[in-house]
Interface confidence: low
Amino acid sequence: KKVVLGKKGDTVELTCTASQKKSIQFHWKNSNQIKILGNQGSFLTKGPSKLNDRADSRRSLWDQGNFPLIIKNLKIEDSDTYICEVEDQKEEVQLLVFGLTANSDTHLLQGQSLTLTLESPPGSSPSVQCRSPRGKNIQGGKTLSVSQLELQDSGTWTCTVLQNQKKVEFKIDIVVLAFQKASSIVYKKEGEQVEFSFPLAFTVEKLTGSGELWWQAERASSSKSWITFDLKNKEVSVKRVTQDPKLQMGKKLPLHLTLPQALPQYAGSGNLTLALEAKTGKLHQEVNLVVMRATQLQKNLTCEVWGPTSPKLMLSLKLENKEAKVSKREKAVWVLNPEAGMWQCLLSDSGQVLLESNIKVLPTWSTPVQP
């Protein structure tokens, strides 16, 4: 008997051909001998099967001796042996309908698990193989699981179901909900305005949820909520904000925060969390602020950085156009009795300057000037 594989929700066409190339009487029945449809002259007649309005044929083909059974919006329970009775002969077609669905939702948070579940008719023993957008192959039986979804897993997953040497292909679009960057670092001189941006790595028509920025200042013993906000249809509204620092927040996406000025007491690490409506779990982005300050106090020229710097970062003090007077893998460097001129404080990583602050040292009878 012929085997045809179908996809849940799709349309399938089961063929039935008579030797005579003309319109003759035919009937399609299911394995319980319940009539699905047939003809009476040029009219299509329907039986009492549960397929009812989902079953159809192509009248235009009857004159050629073709009497297809079309089943729309396939359901798993449509899996059955369908019998076409025409010219005193019976043609049997076994229809197996499969469905492949993602566990709950196709929009999943980064780090969550994706479970693809195969719905299959009783008695079938299909195998499934799926290929992720980044080319990773997974295979399994009734369920396939991928843990710890990453941003690169966003896109179309192609899954092939194999049964009776026949295959049917499913395409499932998966959106991994995440920020574009897991972590970012901002380097600022003391007093400068600080811009934090949290671009999302996905686009959806309506985005609703709530978020909060928790901040752990390097100098503080505990973390503090700097701002809480709501997101409704991509519009941002601030719910609560600390008085110090008084952050400003953009009203549109991407999420954008402005710190009025960089100060040593603000240097540290923040964690922005975003809870999306109808989603369990939260999106996270870490943000770090490094603040530099250069000062001259009496005969001491000091350069300091605050915030999360890596041990390989180099802090230097040098007179303009001269070799560095002092360079250390430390968070503070100083020069005693500095020469008059424009001094530069540099924070660098493998020769690349991340942050620079200039301070003018005047001859000893004057006070220093910071440009």
Epitope: K50, N52, D53, R54, P122, K142
Partner: antibody
Framework: QVQLVQSGAEVKKPGASVKVSCKAS????????IHWVKQATGQGLEWIGE????????YSNAKFKDRVTITADKSTNTAYMELRSLRSDDTAVYFC???????????WGQGTLVTVSS | DIVLTQSPASLAVSPGQRATITCKAG??????????MNWYQQKPGQPPKLLIY???NLESGIPSRFSGSGSGTDFTLTINPVEENDTATYYC?????????FGPGTKVEIK
């Protein structure tokens, strides 16, 4: 949003017939089966039958089969349940219901009280 | 026909406590790994409200205080913790085969 709105209360004499309507909105009427459920005063729930509005195919509980006719009018998005040869034990609230995404009845009409009294 | 029996017929629980209702089916309502049992809550003058479908799936908008478990012929609805407004009658219903059937109901009263 999905809504099922039923016709108003009816008082009927024994032996008469009653036809209760259920108007659907907020979804494609032909995509979902409409079920009918009976609840006698202070009693439990009893499934009467169902209709596939797209085709008019109806299935009913054998207990009601001879006396019930379930129909649907696609043009008005309305399902009907007609109960004939009414008896006093037909006095009940009749609900129409629709499945949600799962297998349970997630959407219900407000109910129609049918009183059979001489 | 599949007959459903519920126990207890009525139950009085204090707020904050756990309420457990069981439903026994005359035959298994399992199919291909799923159990076709649903649970409803009904308050006087209102239509039933779906709480749980396919034995353990929480219907959208229903608090997680409600949970369902079981397979085959034995099923349980648990409310933990119970709140004042949980006073209602609770019904199990099999959607495994026609005729669809409901249990006789369990009346839950909050002390």
């Amino acid at each position: 949003q999905v809504q099922l709105v039923q016709s108003g209360a009816e008082v009927k004499k024994p032996g008469a017939s009653v036809k209760v309507s259920c108007k659907a909105s907020g979804y494609t009427f032909t995509d979902y089966v409409i079920h009918w459920v009976k609840q006698a005063t202070g009693q439990g729930l009893e499934w009467i039958g169902e209709i596939y509005p797209g085709s008019g195919s109806a299935y009913s509980n054998a207990k009601f089969k001879d006396r019930v006719t379930i129909t649907a009018d696609k043009s008005t998005n309305t399902a009907y349940m007609e109960l004939r040869s009414l008896r006093s034990d037909d006095t009940a609230v009749y609900f129409c219901a629709r499945r949600g995404n799962g297998t349970g009845f997630a959407y219900w009409g407000q109910g129609t009280l049918v009183t059979v009294s001489s | 026909d599949i007959v459903l029996t519920q126990s207890p017929a009525s139950l009085a629980v204090s707020p904050g406590q756990r309420a457990t209702i069981t439903c026994k089916a005359g035959q298994s309502v399992d199919y291909d790994g799923d159990s076709y049992m649903n649970w409803y809550q009904q308050k006087p003058g209102q239509p039933p409200k779906l709480l749980i479908y396919v034995a353990s799936n929480l219907e959208s908008g229903i608090p997680s205080r409600f949970s369902g478990s079981g397979s085959g012929t034995d099923f349980t609805l648990t409310i933990n913790p119970v709140e004042e407004n949980d006073t209602a009658t609770y019904y199990c219903q099999q959607s495994y085969k026609d005729p669809l059937a409901f249990g006789p109901g369990t009346k839950v009263e909050i002390k």
